[in-house]
């Protein structure tokens, strides 16, 4: 099918664009081309006789188009107006026509863009900017920049006008900027010139420094105002109320008790119309007063809050030193000072911090101290202690607990039995005690500052017979060579003898085996595998005795080297090669073969049928103990000789 | 000012796929738009591609579109100019151009350039 194809279908204005023919029939008396979409004398540009070689001009013809032999067009120095549909009649030698219709869209180079404003210096907070890219130009697209980074997203950014125009609504002083803008179409891109923003705002509230408002007779005053605000706020200076003068600066030459008062600063920005003042009370001493700490937090609580000293007043040009403990302040990570050494910074308090606290300021002949300050740091309760820490009484004795938690303000206590309430007293006294004063004795300790509230239980048994003991540990499986254990026999009973028995002995004598406790803890240090064993422990008093069950003690070792049976490492050619690798471990080890280096299979046994001269080698089998964390191997060596060449040599299995 | 310098030329066959790189110096290489040009001996400078600051916009000759492309990197200060289905008829001095106001296929609009660098396609 005969089609227009063309090249570029964006032309440039000035530029050339070609109309290519494709798909052109053969036998053809000639052609010609029209502007628009059908065929229209009027709008003939250029026609085309094959058999003359003879082009004619038509009435749309321009002077610029040129017509090739395979029936293309090229127009050249295009203009704006030559954008649009064009026709190209084909006249075969049969007389039968044939159309087709191509098309091209011409964009002009476009301007340098220029950025236009409603607003050459809004204010802050107040005012809405609206920049306008110029021209206004037919087919093209609208791109913004700020500080050559594409638009923010932000509520206060509007873009209208087919992106045209870029509104900033209750502009900021963080909207001055640089803003570009740029105009594309299919040919080229332009950007503007940038523009800055500039915002009116201000003044802020000023600041008045330095900041210390303690100074002694015969200093200098040096004052100084600063206020955020564009354009630069302009400055005055009153004293207690009376105007002083209109400078950034106040500076007063030997001040006496008599410039003490309120000094203010104003500061006014003369385009937004706008005032801010600052008051700062400055002291005159005729002499360094005595120093007194301010504390930001007189009831700070444990762990939690931070605690900041200040060393009162604030002077001028003065050294301030500090004591804890009557003790200069040792070096802590929780203890800082600030840059001119008034503050101290307790940071996470603790019980410990309690002080007292002096600081002090220095002058040219002596050290001026404060009064002692004294933390009082609120902590606990911790966990309640109940003691004495016998479980175990006979009946007919008085039963006498008491319960301590270390607590500030101190702890409040209640008792209670199986969960019953039963007093609210740090003591606990039951006399003539039964059977039935058995049961859990709860100790509540409550600190009504922090709010915080711990409790321990304790079982109470209360029996003429001892009870069967019965062994904890501290490590169920402990490795050998490497860690110990400790055995305690529980219960914990008044007037009771403990004795241990290993696998129905007396204990050995061994450094390796100690007890501690009233003999009631047995530690095994450094435990070997022959330390498995039961150990049994006992209690008696003057009317029963009570033996524990066994405990055996689990015991992690090795793995041990491993041996690789049978022995042989020569075999014949033929035979069954059957290799056993078993290590001394406790859990089993896993096991794994390797051949010349070769992983094979993670069995415990290695079976190979029918072996050869090839199955020569290194034989390795690596043994594994999860539970000790510890490997070991061995490697032997076999040797695979053809049948019948040696005697005497093993058959194999 | 900024100042460029072109890279990566050299010869290749019919076919093959070259990438010239263009390193930029001396000013903020985001406030450049940036365009390739070609010269061929004994023939007038001719444009190849262009692209805009931001890299959003891209234009390109006739005669190698959808062969090259053209793409910078603000971070790393440098112009890309992927050519692949390279033919002879791309053999030419490749030159590499900036503007702080204009992207396009004319050359006027651009006031700085390169050295150049020689690409040669030939079996």
């Known amino acids: 099918k005969l089609t227009i194809e063309s090249t570029p279908f964006n032309v440039a204005e000035g530029k050339e664009v070609l109309l290519l023919v494709h798909n052109l029939p053969q036998h053809l008396f000639g052609y010609s081309w029209y502007k628009g979409e059908r065929v229209d004398g009027n709008r003939q540009i250029i026609g085309y006789v094959i058999g003359t070689q003879q082009a004619t001009p038509g009435p749309a013809y321009s002077g610029r188009e040129i017509i090739y032999p395979n029936a293309s067009l090229l127009i050249q120095n295009i203009i704006q107006n030559d954008t649009g549909f064009y026709t190209l009649h084909v006249i075969k030698s049969d007389l039968v026509n044939e159309e087709a219709t191509g098309q091209f869209r011409v964009y002009p180079e476009l301007p340098k863009p220029s950025i236009s404003s409603n607003n050459s210096k809004p204010v802050e907070d107040k005012d809405a900017v609206a920049f306008t890219c110029e021209p206004e130009t037919q087919d093209a697209t609208y791109l913004w920049w700020v500080n050559n980074q594409s638009l923010p997203v932000s509520p206060r950014l509007q873009l209208s006008n087919g992106n045209r125009t870029l509104t900033l609504f209750n502009v900021t002083r963080n909207d001055t900027a640089s803003y570009k803008c740029e105009t594309q179409n299919p040919v080229s891109a332009r950007r503007s010139d940038s523009v800055i923003l500039n915002v009116l705002y201000g003044p802020d509230a000023p600041t008045i420094s330095p900041l210390n408002t303690s100074y002694r007779s015969g200093e200098n005053l040096n004052l100084s105002c600063h206020a955020a605000s564009n354009p630069p706020a302009q400055y005055s200076w009153f004293v207690n109320g009376t105007f002083q003068q209109s400078t950034q600066e106040l500076f007063i030459p030997n001040i006496t008790v008599n410039n003490s008062g309120s000094y203010t600063c104003q500061a006014h920005n003369s385009d937004t119309g706008l005032n801010r003042t600052t008051v700062t009370t400055i002291t005159v001493y005729a002499e360094p007063p005595k120093p007194f700490i301010t504390s930001n937090n007189s009831n700070p609580v444990e762990d939690e809050d931070a605690v900041a000293l200040t060393c009162e007043p604030e002077i001028q040009n003065t050294t301030y030193l500090w004591w804890v403990n009557n003790q200069s302040l040792p070096v802590s990570p929780r203890l800082q000072l600030s840059n001119d050494n008034r503050t101290l910074t307790l940071l996470s308090v603790t019980r410990n911090d309690v002080g007292p606290y002096e600081c002090g300021i220095q002058n040219e002949l002596s050290v001026d101290h404060s009064d002692p300050v004294i933390l009082n740091v609120l902590y606990g309760p911790d966990d309640p202690t109940i003691s004495p820490s016998y479980t175990y009484y006979r009946p007919g004795v008085n039963l006498s607990l008491s319960c301590h938690a270390a607590s500030n303000p101190p702890a409040q206590y209640s008792w209670l039995i199986d969960g019953n309430i039963q007093q609210h007293t740090q003591e606990l006294f039951i006399s003539n005690i039964t059977e039935k004063n058995s049961g859990l004795y709860t100790c509540q300790a409550n600190n009504s500052a922090s709010g915080h509230s711990r409790t321990t239980v304790k079982t109470i048994t209360v029996s003429a017979e001892l009870p069967k003991p019965s062994i904890s540990s501290n490590n169920s499986k402990p490795v050998e060579d490497k860690d110990a254990v400790a055995f305690t026999c529980e219960p914990e009973a008044q007037n009771t003898t403990y004795l241990w028995w290993v696998n129905g002995q007396s204990l050995p004598v061994s450094p390796r085996l100690q007890l501690s406790n009233g003999n009631r803890t047995l530690t095994l240090f450094n435990v070997t595998r022959n330390d498995a064993r039961a150990y049994v422990c006992g209690i008696q008093n003057s009317v029963s005795a009570n033996r524990s069950d066994p405990v055996t003690l689990d015991v992690l070792y090795g793995p041990d080297t491993p041996i690789i049976s049978p022995p042989d490492s020569s075999y014949l050619s033929g035979a069954n090669l059957n290799l056993s690798c078993h290590s001394a471990s406790n859990p089993s080890p896993q096991y794994s073969w390797r051949i010349n280096g070769i992983p094979q299979q993670h069995t415990q046994v290695l079976f190979i049928a029918k072996i050869t001269p090839n199955n020569n080698g290194t034989y390795a089998c690596f043994v594994s103990n999860l539970a000790t964390g510890r490997n070991n191997s061995i490697v032997k060596s076999i040797t695979v000789s053809a049948s019948g060449t040696s005697p005497g040599l093993s058959a194999g299995a | 000012e900024v100042q460029l310098v072109e890279s990566g030329g050299g010869v290749v066959q019919p076919g093959g796929s070259l990438r010239l790189s263009c390193a930029a110096s001396g000013h903020t290489f985001s406030e450049y738009a940036l365009g390739w040009f070609r010269q061929a001996p004994g023939r007038e400078r001719e444009f190849v591609a262009a692209?805009?600051?931001?890299?959003?916009?891209?234009y390109y000759a006739d005669s190698v579109k959808g062969r090259f492309t053209i793409s910078r990197d603000n971070a790393k200060n440098t112009l890309y100019l992927q050519m692949n289905s390279l033919r002879p008829e791309d053999t030419a001095l490749y030159y590499c151009?900036?503007?702080?106001?204009?992207?396009?296929?004319?050359?006027?609009?651009?006031?700085?350039w390169g050295q150049g660098t020689l690409v040669t396609v030939s079996s």
């Open positions: 692209i805009n600051w931001g890299g959003g916009w891209t």
């Open positions: 151009a900036a503007s702080s106001d204009y992207a396009g296929g004319n050359p006027t609009g651009y006031p700085y």
